[in-house]
């Protein structure tokens, strides 16, 4: 009679994570008598997956009834497969022995590969806000996928970006992989409503890529433009001066009026108006009693936006001239941050 052969017909099996893997194995003879065992790997360190004789293998079931006398089918099913189950599985026939069974013949092995979906991409932006014309970096991470092949794309408002670097880790064989990508994005003044999208495509997603998003509203700071104007007289000795604070984002803004360098009033932007592009406008006014001043008055509107150094615009109010004839916004200047510590 021909010597028993252990046949593992499948060189490889591909299973999606969470599913059941069937590992096929048949023997060509009933002789010699003895159990079969399934192992992962070869050599001394091989891991026991199933032992027909004894043991507890909660995830493993046999395809056929191994207790039947004439059974030669030793196929097994492994349930709830994860990427950690990948490897080469061997069906091994043992010959009954005393005191221990003796390994008789091994199958050629079946390589189990596991397809696992990538996790939802997580996009994160810079820790600090940046202003228009600056380049900022966004990172995108996704984990736990297998096989290694994966495609990652970046978009800004639907337009594909090209300035990015992507790494898939680890470089070598692994049960599962991670992807990490960094994209560079140039900010514009119109980006308050913009979105950056990281899109990941993988064989397990069946053409329906995963997306992660970041809103540029979390990243951008649009500094305000200031305009100080003098309004017509409200009363013989009063002049109304307004400070228009335009196109700023985010809303956090504090304004201080200075009369000849002395703090007159400080207020925080509250009732703002929103522009179509997501930026804000705000207006503050100051009523100046001209009769209280002997000389010309220098009025300064100083704005601290989002914790940044203060910017300011000044307006010279000439006391000698009749207030009604006063021109608007004469001698305006941007004094930058050097007046920040006045108040």
């Amino acid at each position: 009679e021909e010597e028993l052969q252990v046949i593992q017909p499948d060189k490889s099996v591909l299973v999606a994570a969470g599913e059941t893997a069937t590992l096929r194995c048949t023997a060509t003879s009933l002789i010699p008598v003895g159990p079969i065992q399934w192992f992962r790997g070869a050599g001394p360190g091989r891991e026991l997956i199933y032992n027909q004789k004894e043991g507890h293998f909660p995830r493993v079931t046999t395809v056929s009834d191994l207790t039947k006398r004439n059974n030669m089918d030793f196929s097994i099913r492994i349930g709830n497969i994860t990427p950690a189950d990948a490897g080469t599985y061997y069906c091994v026939k043992f010959r009954k022995g005393s005191p221990d069974d003796v390994e008789f013949k091994s199958g050629a092995g079946t390589e189990l590969s596991v397809r696992a979906k990538p996790s939802a991409p997580v996009v994160s932006g810079p820790a600090a806000r940046a202003t228009p014309q600056h380049t900022v970096s966004f990172t995108c991470e996704s984990h736990g996928f297998s096989p290694r092949d994966i495609t990652l794309k970046w978009f800004k408002n639907g337009n594909e970006l090209s300035d990015f670097q992507t790494n898939v880790d680890p470089v070598g064989e692994s049960v599962s992989y991670s992807i990490h990508s960094t994209a560079k994005v140039v900010l514009t003044r119109e980006d308050v409503h913009s979105q950056v999208i990281c899109e990941v495509a993988h064989v397990t997603l069946q053409g329906d890529p995963l997306r992660g998003t970041a809103n540029l509203s979390e990243t951008i700071r649009v500094p305000p433009t200031l305009e100080v104007t003098q309004q017509p007289v409200r009363a013989e000795n009063q002049v109304n001066v307004t400070c228009q604070v335009r196109k700023f984002y985010p809303q956090r803004l504090q304004l201080t009026w200075l009369e000849n360098g002395n703090v007159s009033r400080t207020e925080t932007a509250s009732t703002v108006t929103e522009n179509k592009d997501g930026t804000y406008n705000w207006m503050s006014w100051l009523l100046v009693n001209v009769s209280a001043h002997r000389d010309d008055v220098k009025l300064t509107c100083q704005v601290e936006h989002d914790g940044q150094p203060a910017v300011s615009k000044s307006h010279d109010l000439k006391v000698s001239a009749h207030p009604k004839e006063q021109g608007s916004n004469t001698a305006a200047e941007n004094t930058g941050s050097n007046e920040r510590n006045i108040y």
């Epitope: 065992q37 192992f39 992962r40 790997g41 050599g43 001394p44 360190g45 091989r46 891991e47 026991l48 997956i49 043991g55 507890h56 490897g87 221990d100 390994e103 680890p170 470089v171 070598g172 064989e173």
Partner: antibody, heavy 117, light 108 residues
Framework: DVQLVESGGGLVRPGESLRLSCAAS????????VTWVRQAPGEGLEWVSL???????YYADSVKGRFTISRDNSKSTLYLQMNSLRAEDTAVYYC???????????WGLGTLVTVSS | EIVLTQSPGTLSVSPGERATFSCRAS??????LAWYQQKPGQAPRLLIY???TRATGIPARFSGSGSGTEFTLTISSLQSEDFAVYYC??????????FGGGTKVEIK
């Protein structure tokens, strides 16, 4: 959590015997090979012995015929019976779990064996 | 038996710097090479196997490369906890499982 705890080390004279134990928990002991690795004071790592899931034993040439590795699956415990001990057997003995890739992924903290007259 | 030779014996590096050390096998081991880290008074810890596959929970700053007889372990930016002794081990030809003599990474 996988844990391996060695015990049984101590001071013995040359020619004497000692039996080391390694209690395993946190994994299915019967399904994995386990091994002993030693480290002489100030020296590198030296593999000593391994026992497979089927009970097949393997030894380094330096201990063959003197050391015996065994396992009690019902107690999830690994043993190393050391006979005819020599001064050069002085070392910290670690037990470790062996992966199917034939690398050692979890280690005990070790037990010190000193052989001195 | 396969003999593994590690170099250098000691490597002095400043925190934040890149550290690279090598392991040479006396005969080919394919990609079957592992790396372990051992801190004073502690058991070894598996870092890398199959030459370049990181073990569970090992940070990305550790990377392995090489095949055949020449292998390298790189730590991209040394952290204070990375100062230790590093051993290579071949896992292709058993028994015996052989280790390299180790490379000690110390603070410069």
């Amino acid at each position: 959590d996988v844990q391996l705890v060695e015990s049984g080390g101590g001071l013995v004279r040359p020619g004497e015997s000692l039996r080391l134990s390694c209690a395993a928990s946190g994994f299915t002991f019967t399904n994995y090979a386990v091994t002993w690795v030693r480290q002489a004071p100030g020296e590198g790592l030296e593999w000593v012995s391994l026992i497979s899931v089927t009970g097949t034993t393997y030894y380094a040439d330096s201990v063959k015929g003197r050391f015996t590795i065994s396992r009690d699956n019902s107690k999830s415990t690994l043993y190393l019976q050391m006979n005819s001990l020599r001064a050069e057997d002085t070392a910290v003995y670690y037990c470790a779990k062996v992966t199917w890739k034939n690398v050692f992924d979890y280690w005990g903290l070790g037990t010190l064996v000193t052989v001195s007259s | 038996e396969i003999v593994l030779t590690q170099s250098p014996g000691t490597l002095s590096v400043s925190p934040g710097e890149r550290a690279t050390f090598s392991c040479r096998a006396s005969q080919t081991v394919g990609s079957k090479l592992a790396w372990y880290q051992q801190k004073p008074g502690q058991a070894p810890r598996l870092l890398i196997y199959d030459a370049n596959t990181r073990a569970t929970g090992i940070p990305a700053r550790f990377s392995g490369s090489g095949s055949g007889t020449e292998f390298t372990l790189t730590i991209s930016s040394l952290q204070s906890e990375d100062f230790a002794v590093y051993y290579c081990q071949q896992h292709t030809d058993w028994p015996p499982y052989t280790f390299g003599g180790g490379t000690k990474v110390e603070i410069k």
